[in-house]
């Protein structure tokens, strides 16, 4: 056996992300994506 | 040869149970995620499920959801699908594919959902 | 949920014909489209993945192009083995979605 798939990363999902991926939608930079993913950071 | 031979079809109640299995041979089967995809009688095709090679991310059309269940067995090289509350709307032939796990060099990421080896398909029939 | 609609339903087309079917998606999907055939009895078969890259066996004849949200499926010189079914799918994001399939008859 291999599980190769552990060591890849992969860009969509199998399972229904759609929150986060209707935020991320809306997000249009860079620095949009780095100031909600510290938003997160801080809200821990 | 790369191959997966499917089981478990019939005719079944509304209501009732059925649980459908695919082996796989050919491959390493715990290297792939894998998918269930239907299609009703003279109609197109629905995807249904799709597991991860760990069976740690599945997930469910919403046309099924909390009512069928996905799993895998690697030691087995089996997938399975448990079909619960089975509804008329449920009749269909039901397919077990490989997802290809595509590889994009530009973006240096892989993607779900390209299903490049397909089982011969097992009928359910759901009726009163 | 992305929808993804095929042109036209049916076509009838004679061997020897150029024969091309557009898919178009309710919302881009860069280049994230996969093309299936289906004969009657049979289970589909992958053909072109990522908008134009040919599965490995199949004949050059078919070819694939598009990004965003339109997409063709050419087959250059229709054959005999040609005349099936044939189903867009996006794969972009969850859930996996089809088109409704084109089916190809012989005129």
């Known amino acids: 056996g291999g599980g190769g798939s552990k060591h890849k990363c992969f860009r969509n999902s199998l399972e229904n992300n759609e929150t986060l991926e209707s935020i991320m939608n809306t997000l249009e930079s860079e620095e949009d994506f780095r100031k909600y993913f510290y938003y997160l950071e801080g809200s821990k | 040869e790369v191959q997966l031979v499917q089981s478990g079809g019939g005719l079944v109640q509304p209501g009732r149970s059925l649980r459908l299995s695919c082996a796989a041979s050919?491959?390493?089967?715990?290297?792939?995620?894998m998918h269930w995809v239907r299609q009703a009688p003279g109609k197109g095709l629905e995807w249904v499920s799709g597991i991860s090679w760990n069976s740690g991310s599945i997930g469910y059309a919403d046309s099924v959801k909390g009512r069928f269940t996905s799993s895998r067995d690697n030691a087995k090289n089996s997938l399975y699908l448990q079909m619960n509350s089975l509804r008329a709307e449920d009749t269909a032939l039901y397919y077990c594919?490989?997802?290809?796990?595509?590889?994009?060099?530009?973006?240096?990421?892989?993607?779900?959902?390209?299903?490049?080896?397909w089982g011969q398909g097992t009928t359910v029939t759901v009726s009163s | 949920d992305i929808q993804m609609t095929q042109s036209p339903s049916f076509l009838s087309a004679s061997v020897g014909d150029r024969v091309t079917i557009t898919c178009w998606a309710s919302q881009g999907i860069s280049s994230y489209l996969a093309w299936y055939q289906q004969k009657p009895g049979k289970a589909p078969k992958l053909l072109i993945y990522a908008a134009s890259t040919l599965q490995s066996g199949v004949p050059s004849r078919f070819s694939g192009s598009g990004s965003g949200t339109e997409f063709t499926l050419t087959i250059s010189s229709l054959q005999p083995e040609d005349f099936a079914t044939y189903y867009c799918?996006?794969?972009?994001?969850?859930?996996?979605?089809f088109g409704q399939g084109t089916k190809v008859e012989i005129k």
């Open positions: 050919g491959f390493t089967f715990d290297d792939y995620a």
């Open positions: 594919a490989k997802d290809m796990e595509y590889y994009d060099i530009l973006t240096g990421y892989y993607s779900y959902y390209i299903m490049d080896v």
């Open positions: 799918q996006q794969f972009n994001s969850y859930p996996p979605t």
